[in-house]
Amino acid sequence: FERTRSLQDPCSNCPAGTFCDNNRNQICSPCPPNSFSSAGGQRTCDICRQCKGVFRTRKECSSTSNAECDCTPGFHCLGAGCSMCEQDCKQGQELTKKGCKDCCFGTFNDQKRGICRPWTNCSLDGKSVLVNGTKERDVVCGPSPADLSPGASSVTPPAPAREPGHSPQ
């Protein structure tokens, strides 16, 4: 049945990298320059994506696959298949309509992209702040105040030693 279906649809016999050419009695012709078909049976080839401006070419277009873009230094990809490039900011900043702005007190961003996020509220987990937060780093939560009462140890016991030359199973 599969063979009969391909007989009935001459175009289905055209492999990736070609198209079913109605101007040549439906024989399979190669995709023209700067176009591609990633699947067989195509009646047209798709135009290759061009990585221009803030986009740069990560992978060249071929007859069977589209070009892939990424962003020039100082920018990062957004969206499926890097459909947009967004300006990088420094750690401790976020991108606004007016450009890169420092994170407000009580928030941080440890990446060059994205928004500033609130510091973790250690007390919600019944813990205390061990290391204060900054614009670039979240707070580090430590043991709860009760765990630090006299007689309580805040030191984690060491892990059991392994024999040298053996990796864990």
């Epitope: 007989l7 055209c14 009695n25 439906q26």
Partner: antibody, heavy 115, light 107 residues
């Protein structure tokens, strides 16, 4: 321009063998289904066989056991190996490009089977 | 296998006249039918594919119609170069088969 040039025909005795060739140009041979069609003198057209770009084949059931189609994509050439030839195989043999639609044909090569 | 029967066997007409050639299939072949023209000493040439689509470079005086089992090739106004043998061919199922041909001759 699509061009198909058959060769290898001639006079052969009954029971003999012959290999026909079809040199293709003007299109992407390696991407296309290729066919052999024959025409006995003064008669109509009879489809013989086809081979896909990947090498899968299909035959007219009346000929399959004696005829073998093949292709060499690196040489842009189609072949038809004909064995155990009979007088009724006398015909002009055409190669043609296309799947279902035989869009372009060569001029044919005459095979005569006679003692 | 699918048998194609063409009629008439021979059609005698004059240039300028309209020609109607028929092809009947032994079972339903949808629109999987082609028409070819063959002149003496030449290879066949594809005229119509898919029952009604004109092949590359074919003048618009040639038209095809039909579906299922009954098909027609029409030449609206015969030119001297149109006198030839015409074959229909089905590609609904293997083996591919041809009709026996219709000879279009000058009256």
């Amino acid at each position: 321009e699509v061009q198909l040039l058959e060769s290898g025909g001639g006079l052969v005795q009954p029971g003999g063998s012959l290999r026909l060739s079809c040199a293709a140009s003007g299109f992407t041979f390696s991407s296309n289904v290729m066919n052999w069609v024959r025409q006995a003198p003064g008669k109509g057209l009879e489809w013989v066989s086809e081979i896909s770009h990947s090498g899968s084949t299909n035959y007219n059931p009346s000929l399959k056991s004696r005829f073998t189609i093949s292709r060499d994509n690196s040489k842009n050439t189609l072949y038809l190996q004909m064995n155990s030839l009979r007088a009724e195989d006398t015909a002009v043999y055409y190669c043609a490009v296309g799947a279902g639609n035989l869009g372009y044909w060569g001029q044919g090569t005459l095979v005569t089977v006679s003692s | 296998e699918i048998v194609l029967t063409q009629s008439p066997g021979t059609l005698s007409l004059s240039p300028g006249e309209r020609a109607t050639l028929s092809c009947q299939a032994s079972q339903d072949i949808s629109n999987y039918l082609n028409w070819y023209q063959q002149k003496p000493g030449q290879a066949p040439r594809l005229l119509i594919y898919g029952a009604s689509s004109r092949a590359t470079g074919i003048p618009d005086r040639f038209s095809g119609s039909g579906s299922g089992t009954d098909f027609t090739l029409t030449i609206s106004r015969l030119e001297p170069e149109d006198f030839a043998v015409y074959y229909c061919q089905q590609y609904n199922s293997y083996p591919i088969t041809f009709g026996q041909g219709t000879k279009l001759e000058i009256k």
